[in-house]
């Protein structure tokens, strides 16, 4: 076909110059020579479809899929991956070829799959298909479960796409609030994938394999409960299933429930109702709103209305990519030696994050607690009053977040001294960082009150030990003080400490340590 453009598909493998966990470079820096992926016309396909050779990528590797188009005039394009459209900005190279690139940083299982590139040129439209898979180092995973409606039944199936295939259990609770904690007697667990009893107060599905346990709660609006002060919000990514349950109890059966999205009734096939009588003969109705695979236009206010209850709403937000929203500015804290204190990070994220707290190259478990306003909080209290730098790191499928904290412990200086043939040095790690004085002890000054100002060199931050600053002061030896005892004193707002040194000795000779409060 004369009109078809000349197309070249290439793979560029990048050498990440930082492969450390928890760091993400904005763009891989060093790249190897491009590998030609062929891009042959696909036979018997409707429309013009080019297919690139399959791409196998190592876990955590960074690559660029690139298409070079030799066609006259401007081109416009669109990438589609897993039903999501992704931004596409073509540019032109020195040979005036159109260049379209897709960068995949730190390859993960979630980024494996088919990448479709739709290109529109002045002459014709065509599609290019890339298939990207992870090289065969099997990755066991544990993914958050999701719900599906059971075919031809009013029941929910719980699915977790994990390996090894997880043990799935439903966690049900019929009481309110605190009594629905995991080990409470009010909690019932059912080790099965299908749940028929959907009237409970709190319904969660959990999946566990040797990597741990992940749970998903069935998002519920209860019309008999007082609405939250802030509107409940539910985040989903394009392509994920949406499930919202509306529940209402009334003295008799004479009431109905309806779902609306932005004041328009949900289409049939996007909801189903169930009802039952409770033990006290009141009627319980539940109405599910569900979308098997959400798109951007499913975003909005979902309102459940009843003929006998005030209506309530939830805001459903569909996002292209996951996110972690939090302030990443570093924070410094100053506490007393026995003061109770916890670091905390408040964030909003979807999908749920995994996080770690790190101090002195050691990682600590990270717990998250959901707040009523849609935010979550992670606290770290296990610092054991050790000063230094603490790092909070969070990741989900699509985003990474790091926040630094510095902890300073207010305490009186502790002084260590050492001497060489030419100088004497004193070190202290008190906080606030101490100031220094040097004094000479002589016949004229037996109490060591004669201050030395010549030859003193103070360094405020000599070395940083995991974020803990150490201050030092050095006295260069002169003939005037050789053979004498000298005293170095470090003082801050909490007190003073001193060390006495004999200056003619070649080695360290701490004579007396004075602790003057």
């Amino acid at each position: 076909n004369q009109d078809l453009p000349v197309i070249k598909c290439v793979l560029i493998n990048h050498k990440n110059n930082d492969s450390s966990v928890g760091k993400s470079s904005s763009y891989p820096m060093v790249s190897e020579s491009p590998e030609d992926l062929g891009c042959a016309l696909r036979p018997q396909s409707s429309g013009t479809v080019y297919e690139a050779a399959a791409v196998e990528v190592d876990v955590s590797a960074s690559i660029t899929l690139q298409v070079l188009v030799d066609a006259p005039g401007n081109i416009s394009c669109l990438w589609v991956f897993k039903h999501s459209s992704l931004n596409c900005q073509p540019h032109f190279d020195l040979q005036n070829r159109g260049v379209v690139s897709m960068v995949i940083l730190k390859m993960t299982e979630t980024q494996a799959g088919e990448y479709l590139l739709f290109i529109q040129s002045e002459a014709t439209n065509y599609t290019i298909l890339f298939t990207v898979s992870i090289r065969n180092t099997l990755l066991y995973t544990l993914r958050r479960p999701y719900f599906r409606k059971m075919e031809n039944q009013d029941a929910l199936v719980c699915i977790s796409e994990s390996v090894p295939e997880p043990i799935v259990e439903w966690v049900l609770c019929d009481s309110q609030g605190e009594s629905c904690k995991e080990e409470s007697p009010a909690v019932v667990k059912k080790e099965e994938k299908v749940l028929h009893e959907l009237f409970g107060t709190d319904i969660r599905c959990c999946a566990r394999n040797e990597l741990g346990r992940e749970c998903t709660r069935l998002f519920t609006i209860d019309l008999n409960q007082t609405p939250q002060t802030t509107l409940p919000q539910l985040f989903l990514k394009v392509g994920e299933p949406l499930w919202i349950r509306c529940k209402a109890v009334h003295v008799n059966h004479g009431f109905g429930l309806t779902w609306e999205l932005e004041n328009k009734a949900l289409e049939e096939g996007n909801y189903f109702e169930m009802s039952t009588y409770s033990t006290n003969r009141t009627m319980i109705r539940i109405l599910f709103a569900f979308v098997s695979s959400v798109a951007r236009n499913d975003t909005g206010y979902y309102t459940c209305s009843s003929s006998k209850h005030p209506s309530q709403s939830a805001l459903v937000t569909i996002v292209e990519k996951g996110f972690i929203n939090a302030t990443n500015s570093s924070e410094d804290y100053e506490i007393d030696q026995y003061e109770e204190f916890c670091f905390s990070v408040r964030f909003k994220a979807y999908p749920q994050i995994r996080c770690t707290w790190t101090f002195s190259r050691k990682s600590f478990p990270c717990e998250q607690k959901g707040l009523d306003n849609g935010y979550s909080i992670s606290k770290f209290c296990n610092h054991k009053h050790q000063p230094g730098e603490y790092i909070f790191h969070a990741e989900n499928d699509d985003a990474q977040f790091t926040k630094m904290f510095t902890l300073n412990i207010r305490r009186k200086p502790q002084v260590l001294a050492e001497a060489s043939a030419s100088q004497a040095s004193c070190f202290s790690d008190g906080y606030p960082l101490p100031s220094w004085t040097w004094k000479k002890c002589s016949d004229k000054s037996p109490n060591c009150t004669e201050e030395i100002t010549e030859g003193v060199w103070n360094r405020k931050a000599n070395r940083k030990v995991f974020g803990q600053w150490v201050s030092s002061s050095t006295l260069n030896m002169s003939e005037a003080i050789k053979g004498f005892l000298v005293k170095c004193c470090a003082y801050n707002s909490l007190g003073t400490s001193c060390e006495t040194i004999l200056l003619n000795s070649p080695g360290p000779f701490p004579f007396i340590q004075d602790n003057i409060s």
Partner: antibody, heavy 129, light 107 residues
Amino acid sequence: QVQLVESGGGVVQPGRSLRLSCAASGFTFSSYGMHWVRQAPGKGLEWVAVISYDGSNEFYADSVKGRFTISRDNSKNTLYLQMNSLRAEDTAVYYCARGGEITMVRGVIGYYYYGMDVWGQGTTVTVSS
Amino acid sequence: DIQMTQSPSSLSASVGDRVTITCRASQSISSYLNWYQQKPGKAPKLLIYAASSLQSGVPSRFSGSGSGTEFTLTISSLQPEDFATYYCLQHNSYPLTFGGGTKVEIK
């Protein structure tokens, strides 16, 4: 070098208990899932149990569920198998084996899994009256 | 539980022969299958992981193939040190299950 050494085997009467240990060295023990596998005399291999890298999750073969408990002490680099209510059919050589290595890839926790790639030499358990 | 059926249960072969052992899973296990070699009185040794990936240090005469339910271990040219029992293992779901084993003997 990477090594696993089992101990604690012996002759025990039916209904009694025994505790096996597996000492690990040469690798970061706390980053790996760990398994117990057994082999009855003249028979094939039978998987017994697995424990996650942090000890929070365990899974068992139906034949030992409720009687055996797998556990670990990461501070001592040691894996354990507590065997209660022992039966004649539990007579076997018991091996410990290293499983997957923990990783976190973009928020998804996972194991890189190359199979049970390191095995101990085995310890013999004989259940007999 | 997933059943792993290994065949043959034993075979006789000569040095230099090409040997093929198969393993069939009762349901799909994707590529979550390993092959092990065991000699009398010794612990098993991993040969192949992920159905077809050769474990480092294992001679290239060993190869694995298959996915889903049908898997094959091939020894392209049998060597004297290859006479042993071979097991497959599925680790797609709990409980993990081994095949019954294939004993490769000298003809």
